[in-house]
Interface confidence: low
C-alpha cells in the first residue's frame, strides 16, 4: 500500500508512517516502528502537557510569585497548568495573571458599583443625586442621604455627592 500523506486524529506522520501521539500528561520518548508502539512517559513533578502531543519535554507549571502578589488558585496536574490568582485586596494585571496590583479605591463622591475580584478591578460610579460617599473605599457603596422628615426634622444643610444632609429641629410657631 501507498504510505499515508495524512494520519488519523491522535496520530502524527513521521518517516511516511503514522504513529500514535502521546496522551495529555505524557511526553514522547521514541517514535513508533513497524512493530513497536509510540513510547511515552508521564511528565515529572511540576510539569504538564495539556494536549495529545509529540513533545519530547513537558512544560513547567506556572510559578505563582508571592513577590508579585500572586498565590495558587488551582494546583497544576500532569495535564493542566497551575492557575494563579492575586492575594486578598489585589487583582491581576492581565488575563494570564502574571502580576497583581492593589484594588482601586473609589474616591469621595464615588461609590463601589462592583467589588474587585482576583481578576478584575473595583468598578466605581459617581454618587447620584440623593446619595453620597465621604470616604475613599474599595468596598463602600454610595449611601442615601438621611431622610430628615422621617425623624421629624428639617434639612438645615443640603447634601452633596460627598456629604450627607444636615438635619435640624423644625422652627415652632410662637403662640
Amino acid at each position: 500500500p501507498e504510505p499515508p500523506t495524512a494520519c488519523r486524529e491522535k496520530q502524527y506522520l513521521i518517516n511516511s508512517q503514522c504513529c500514535s501521539l502521546c496522551q495529555p500528561g505524557q511526553k514522547l520518548v521514541s517514535d513508533c516502528t513497524e512493530f513497536t508502539e509510540t513510547e511515552c512517559l508521564p511528565c515529572g513533578e511540576s510539569e504538564f502537557l495539556d494536549t495529545w502531543n509529540r513533545e519530547t519535554h513537558c512544560h513547567q507549571h506556572k510559578y505563582c510569585d508571592p513577590n508579585l502578589g500572586l498565590r495558587v488558585q488551582q494546583k497544576g496536574t500532569s495535564e493542566t497548568d497551575t492557575i494563579c490568582t492575586c492575594e486578598e485586596g489585589w487583582h491581576c494585571t492581565s488575563e494570564a495573571c502574571e502580576s497583581c496590583v492593589l484594588h482601586r479605591s473609589c474616591s469621595p463622591g464615588f461609590g463601589v458599583k462592583q467589588i474587585a475580584t482576583g481578576v478584575s478591578d473595583t468598578i466605581c460610579e459617581p454618587c447620584p443625586v440623593g446619595f453620597f460617599s465621604n470616604v475613599s473605599s474599595a468596598f463602600e457603596k454610595c449611601h442615601p442621604w438621611t431622610s430628615c422628615e422621617t425623624k421629624d426634622l428639617v434639612v438645615q444643610q443640603a447634601g452633596t455627592n460627598k456629604t450627607d444632609v444636615v438635619c435640624g429641629p423644625q422652627d415652632r410657631l410662637r403662640a
Epitope: 500500500p1 504510505p3 496520530q11 508512517q17 496522551q23 509510540t38
Partner: antibody, heavy 125, light 112 residues
Framework: QVQLVESGGGVVQPGRSLRLSCVAS????????MHWVRQAPGKGLEWVAI????????YYADSVKGRFTISRDNSKNTLYVQMNSLRAEDTAVYYC??????????????????WGQGTTVTVSS | DIVMTQSPLSLPVTPGEPASISCRSS???????????LDWYLQKPGQSPQLLIY???NRASGVPDRFSGSGSGTDFTLKISRVEAEDVGVYYC?????????FGQGTKVEIK
C-alpha cells in the same frame, strides 16, 4: 475465505535445515505484517519472528536469532521461514499468523487475527 | 523482554457458571495512545489458536459476547459470563506492545 496454509514440516536431523511455507488466500497478503509462532509438544505458545508487510523489517526471538530467516514473496502470497542449524528444542508445531492491521496504519491493531493450521517439525537423530 | 504471568494455570469449570482468568505483565502495556496492547487467544483441543480479545477489551469478529476482557497497565482479566462446553481449551494472553511478543504460560479450562 481468509485462510493461511502452512507446509514443509517433517522429520530432520539436528544441524540440518528446513524451509516452511505459508500460503495466504482470501485477503491482500501484501498489506499485512506476518508472524511465525511455534508450540513444542505439550507446551505453550512461543513467538518466533515477524516480518513487515513489505519485507523491509524483520525481528526474531533470541532463541532462533542467527539460525532462522523470515521472508516473504508478495507476488506468490507466501510467507517463509528458513530454519538452519536445527536443534532438538526446535521440535514444535509451527503456525503462521496475520498481524491484524492495514498497511502502515499503526493506530489500528487487531491482534493476530488469522492463524494457519500448523505444520509439525521434528528434530531428531 | 516483557514477562507475562497467568493464573490460575488450571481452571475446572461448571457449564453455565462464570469463569475468570488473570494475566499480569512485568511492565505496563499502556502506551501514550490510551490502548492496552494485550490480546487473549484460545486454543481448543487439536486446533490452532484463535483470537478472542485484542487491545485489552475488544472482542474479535465472531467471538460470542459471553467473553469479555478488562484491565489496564499491568493487570488484565478475561471473563466468561456463562461457560459452555465448547469453551474448553487453553487460554493465552499475549503482549503486543513490544518485540519480542511474549505469551503467558496458558490456562487450561476444563469441565468439572
Amino acid at each position: 475465505q481468509v485462510q493461511l496454509v502452512e507446509s514443509g514440516g517433517g522429520v530432520v536431523q539436528p544441524g540440518r535445515s528446513l524451509r516452511l511455507s505459508c500460503v495466504a488466500s482470501g485477503f491482500t497478503f501484501s498489506n499485512y505484517g506476518m508472524h511465525w509462532v511455534r508450540q513444542a509438544p505439550g507446551k505453550g505458545l512461543e513467538w518466533v519472528a515477524i516480518i513487515s508487510y513489505d519485507g523491509s523489517n524483520k525481528y526474531y526471538a533470541d532463541s532462533v536469532k542467527g539460525r532462522f530467516t523470515i521472508s516473504r514473496d508478495n507476488s506468490k502470497n507466501t510467507l517463509y521461514v528458513q530454519m538452519n542449524s536445527l536443534r532438538a528444542e526446535d521440535t514444535a508445531v509451527y503456525y503462521c499468523a496475520r498481524r491484524g492491521h492495514y498497511g502502515r496504519d499503526y493506530y489500528s491493531y487487531y491482534g493476530l487475527d488469522v492463524w494457519g493450521q500448523g505444520t509439525t517439525v521434528t528434530v531428531s537423530s | 523482554d516483557i514477562v507475562m504471568t497467568q493464573s490460575p494455570l488450571s481452571l475446572p469449570v461448571t457449564p453455565g457458571e462464570p469463569a475468570s482468568i488473570s494475566c499480569r505483565s512485568s511492565q505496563s502495556l499502556l502506551p501514550g495512545n490510551g490502548y492496552n496492547y494485550l490480546d487473549w487467544y484460545l486454543q481448543k483441543p487439536g486446533q490452532s489458536p484463535q483470537l478472542l480479545i485484542y487491545l485489552g477489551s475488544n472482542r474479535a469478529s465472531g467471538v460470542p459476547d459471553r467473553f469479555s476482557g478488562s484491565g489496564s497497565g499491568t493487570d488484565f482479566t478475561l471473563k466468561i459470563s456463562r461457560v459452555e462446553a465448547e469453551d474448553v481449551g487453553v487460554y493465552y494472553c499475549m503482549q503486543a506492545l513490544q518485540t519480542p511478543r511474549t505469551f503467558g504460560q496458558g490456562t487450561k479450562v476444563e469441565i468439572k
